[in-house]
């Protein structure tokens, strides 16, 4: 019906038992598209379909989806198709998010909070990891302390920072004057006895095309780690850029077009023009991947009514290496904290 | 059948803040953009505010826009509207109604929000 | 914003007379795919309003077939090929192409 989120309801009629096992095709060449692109209700975005054929409107969180009728990938939601099988022809979609984690061999579902060990506490969020410390003990007065130690406490799980560099005054823990460290507006952002922790963003979902990036922050009221998205796009799919690649090269590591143009986003344009880096591609091997980035607002306008703003990927530079590990590894950013070791092995 | 059944009006000094609330049923409320409407008395109908079918988009009229907050608990079938720094001229009857893409199908009985000192 | 300006504003009718509608909107109501999202609405005194006609001249279920709608791109009519006693009220045009939704003023209809 024309008021549900998908305007053109999809009745899936399931097979006959005998042909369970056969998948029905969903796409059909050459395309067959209506003359007008559908109008898609509020907060739905308009997009090709799977066949990549015709303008349709996205099924959202709890649609069925086909390969031809595919979930909106704008919120992050995937054709879950567990429940079909074998055919695997008719799925829901499903968000992205709600996946388990792994960690050291043990598995952790998602939301699921645990401590690897007395010094951290990590909670599963849509297969990430993100952990925050439970050591808070502040850095060491600046204001007198010159030498400062951190000494391990018998006894207790977490280090204690000592000073003893300054004769006129006695040995004592950081902890005791956190009131000298204060004044000197030194103070580590907090919430609560809470560290501030932002995991990296997330590898773009597509090689190609919109994709979206995520990350796992707890900067907010609560600390709570929450998901945080931005959209992405690595290199556009229409472009072969092997064929930017110069001559005797094997690699072009940045393609960037020669126009300025508008990004699109579900039919809505970007108020102003951008002339995007994409990261290229190789002949060989390697992969490219950006390694010179940050997160930019982009603002939309719609033609039928106000716009919107959507955080999204900027490259500044790429690199091409063999290393095509997938980088969605929250724990090379720990490495920076005291004793990673214990948490990472 | 479906239902939209509002509660929340009543009379207020300009300046203060008023909640109102739209409990929906006979339908899947989580999958339908919802929105307000009003009709100062003896006057015609001012459409209002509306919020997408899980809230992640709003639109709202130029009279109402930084005072006006529209929002909805889709599990609890409800649709709210907060009404801050409340003017004389916000009195009105509002009615919450259901969109219909391109249309409103479904409009509630109305609560009155007179705004007096 | 998109304007729509309704006439007559009052609009006397004998019963079993016809009555017409003009509603005129400042920009064009083609929707990009294809269609025109106008709507008529009437409003009984001391009641919500409802849904008449959509998509400029679809008529709701339970609406009486006296009821019709019709025009394009800018100039829309509501007709009514009988009225009767019970139509007494206000009818409203409104657009749902662009946003906001906009409302005509309002036409009342009264029985002579």
């Known amino acids: 019906t024309a008021l549900s989120p998908t305007p053109t309801t999809m009745t899936f009629t399931p097979a006959p038992l005998e042909e369970t096992t056969t998948r029905p095709e969903f796409c059909k060449w050459p395309c067959e598209c209506p003359q007008s692109p559908p109008r898609c209700p509020l907060g739905v975005s308009l997009i090709t379909d799977g066949c990549e054929c015709c303008k349709i409107c996205a099924q959202q969180l709890g649609d069925n989806c086909t390969e031809a009728a595919i979930c909106d990938p704008h919120r992050g939601l995937y054709c879950d198709y567990s429940g079909d099988r074998p055919r695997y022809a008719i799925g829901v979609c499903a968000q992205v998010v709600g996946v388990g984690c792994v960690l050291d061999g043990v598995r952790y579902t998602n939301g699921e909070s645990f401590q690897p060990n007395c010094r951290y506490n990590c909670t599963c969020i849509d297969g990430t990891v993100g952990c925050t410390p439970l050591c808070l003990s502040p850095r060491p007065p600046r204001l007198w302390c010159r030498q400062p130690r951190h000494v391990r406490v018998p006894g207790q799980c977490c280090e204690q920072w000592v000073c003893d560099d300054d004769a006129r005054r006695p040995r004592q823990t950081a902890l005791l004057d956190t009131r000298a460290f204060a004044a000197s507006g030194a103070v580590e952002q907090r919430y609560e006895n809470c560290i501030a922790y932002t995991s990296p963003w997330s590898p773009c979902s597509t090689t190609c095309g919109l994709g979206i990036s995520t990350r796992i922050s707890n900067v907010n009221a609560r600390c709570w780690p929450e998901q945080e998205s931005r959209l992405c796009n690595l290199r556009p799919c229409d472009v072969d850029i092997q064929l930017h690649i110069k001559a005797g090269k094997k690699c072009l590591a940045v393609y960037q077009p020669e126009e300025a143009t508008n990004f699109t986003l579900a039919g809505c344009v970007s108020t102003r023009t951008y002339r995007p880096k994409y990261c290229g591609v190789c002949t060989d091997n390697r992969c490219c991947i950006p390694y010179k980035s940050k997160t930019i607002s982009v603002d939309f306008q719609c033609p039928e009514g106000p716009g919107f703003s959507r955080q999204v990927l900027w490259i500044n530079a790429c690199f091409c290496n063999l290393s095509c590990r997938n980088p969605n590894d929250i724990f090379a950013d720990l490495e920076s904290y005291p004793d990673f070791e214990e948490i990472a092995n | 059948q479906v239902q939209l059944v509002e509660s929340g009006g009543g009379v207020v000094q300009p300046g203060r803040s008023l909640r109102l609330s739209c409990g929906a049923s006979?339908?899947?409320?989580?999958?339908?953009?919802m929105h307000w409407v009003r009709q100062a008395p003896g006057k015609g109908l001012e459409w209002v505010t509306v919020?997408?079918?899980?809230?992640?988009?709003?639109y709202y009229a130029d009279s109402v826009k930084g005072r006006f907050t529209i929002s909805r608990d889709n599990s609890k079938n409800t649709l709210y509207l907060q009404m801050n720094s409340l003017r004389v001229d916000d009195t009105a009857v509002y009615f919450c109604?259901?969109?219909?893409?391109?249309?409103?199908?479904?409009w509630g009985q109305g609560t009155l929000v007179t705004v007096s000192s | 914003d998109v304007v729509m300006t309704q006439s007559p504003l009052s609009l006397p009718v004998t019963i079993g007379q016809p009555a017409s509608i003009s509603c005129r909107s400042s920009q064009g109501l083609v929707y990009s795919d294809g269609n025109t999202y106008l709507n008529w609405f009437q409003q009984r005194p001391g009641q919500s309003p409802r849904r008449l006609i959509y998509?400029?001249?679809n008529r709701d279920s339970g609406v009486p077939d006296r009821f019709s709608g019709s025009g394009s791109g800018t100039d829309f009519t509501l007709k009514i090929s009988r009225v009767e006693a019970e139509d007494v009220g206000v009818y409203y045009c409104?657009?749902?192409?662009?946003?906001?939704?906009?409302f005509g003023q309002g036409t009342k209809l009264e029985i002579k």
């Open positions: 109604a259901r969109d219909a893409l391109g249309s409103i199908d479904y």
């Open positions: 998509k400029v001249s």
């Open positions: 409104m657009q749902g192409t662009h946003w906001p939704y906009t």
């Open positions: 919020t997408s079918f899980d809230g992640s988009e709003i």
């Open positions: 006979g339908f899947t409320f989580s999958r339908f953009a």
